[in-house]
Amino acid sequence: MMTGTIETTGNISAEKGGSIILQCHLSSTTAQVTQVNWEQQDQLLAICNADLGWHISPSFKDRVAPGPGLGLTLQSLTVNDTGEYFCIYHTYPDGTYTGRIFLEVLESSVAEHGARFQIP
């Protein structure tokens, strides 16, 4: 039975050109994490394998950095980065756990509108 839960950084609103950290944390299970995949829509961004370490997809190498921990750092944000990001934890013996984070990247002109938030 899958007893674990995924906690995420929560949704993030950021400004174009900035950088953000996406993180997930798996709790309430003793299952072993064998691999964590980071995906956006149907695109694979990065893999962190327990044995082989990190692999960043070639198309994201310039703007995606591994960590901290099992998280992912996105740099030089563009409006095109707006979308849903998935952390997919492959575990044994539980199976797969998935967390979801929505990233909203705003043009500077929009970000200023009513801004009383900390903009990453």
């Epitope: 995420t8 950084t9 929560g10 949704n11 993030i12 609103s13 953000i20 950290i21 993180q23 829509q41 409006v79 095109n80 707006t82 979308g83 849903e84 979801r100 984070i101 929505f102 909203e104 705003l106 043009e107 002109s109 929009v110 509108h113 009513g114 009383r116 938030f117 900390q118 990453p120």
Partner: antibody, heavy 117, light 112 residues
Framework: EVQLQQSGPELVKPGASMKISCKAS????????MNWVKQSHGKNLEWIGL????????SYNQKFKGKATFTVDKSSSTAYMELLSLTSEDSAVYYC??????????WGQGTTLTVSS | DVVVTQTPLSLPVSFGDQVSISCRSS???????????LSWYLHKPGQSPQLLIY???NRFSGVPDRFSGSGSGTDFTLKISTIKPEDLGMYYC?????????FGGGTKLEIK
């Protein structure tokens, strides 16, 4: 002035599909997300999901995955939500709403959907 | 999914009253950057819902200052300082920090 103009009420048969439109004006259509909300029984509000008109990225409430599909036509600043395999449970008022920082700033007038044979 | 519980379900008032509506979430609504995406809406009969407050306490443009929001973490409050006839209707809170976004069940503000 920001305006979201939705298509009119619909009466459809069970099993059919239908598409609601939401025409945006008064702002840059691609600069904000477009959200869809369901209101059942005149009370409960449910977030169906959103689409980012800039790149077509979508996010769905899992409850509505396979039920709702979002698209946009940037040339006419119009967002669409198609509802599939309709049942009486889908009878409701559906709203489009412009999103910013995970709140719903401006709402359309609502589209009433009645599913009945 | 994050469960958002709103109280009370119904709030009978007289014009001029001050009232509070509570919204509680099943987990913290602060993201890793310290931003909390909790907003409040008023839905009047025959109209579309309208945004009152976003980010816990920021009044949306054109919203009178008799409306105020407060709270943190999992506990949030909407206060209306002097009830006017145009304030009657259903009030909803919405959390947008976690996927999927979830609404509270609503509070009906009505005349005693």
């Amino acid at each position: 002035e920001v305006q979201l103009q939705q298509s009119g009420p619909e009466l459809v048969k069970p099993g059919a599909s239908m598409k609601i439109s939401c025409k945006a004006s008064g702002y840059s259509f691609t600069g904000y997300t477009m959200n869809w909300v369901k209101q059942s029984h005149g009370k409960n509000l449910e977030w169906i999901g959103l689409i980012n008109p800039y790149n077509g990225a979508t996010s769905y409430n899992q409850k509505f995955k396979g039920k709702a599909t979002f698209t946009v036509d940037k040339s006419s600043s119009t967002a669409y939500m198609e509802l599939l395999s309709l049942t009486s449970e889908d009878s409701a008022v559906y709203y489009c709403a412009r999103g910013l920082r995970f709140s719903l700033e401006y709402w359309g007038q609502g589209t009433t959907l009645t599913v009945s044979s | 999914d994050v469960v958002v519980t709103q109280t009370p379900l119904s709030l009978p008032v007289s014009f001029g009253d001050q009232v509070s509506i509570s919204c509680r979430s099943s987990q913290s609504l602060a993201n890793s950057y310290g931003n909390t995406y909790l907003s409040w809406y008023l839905h009047k009969p025959g109209q579309s819902p309208q945004l009152l407050i976003y980010g816990i306490s920021n009044r949306f443009s054109g919203v009178p200052d008799r409306f105020s929001g407060s709270g943190s973490g999992t506990d949030f409050t909407l206060k209306i300082s002097t009830i006017k006839p145009e304030d009657l209707g259903m009030y909803y809170c919405l959390q947008g920090t976690h996927q999927p976004w979830t609404f509270g069940g609503g509070t009906k503000l009505e005349i005693k």
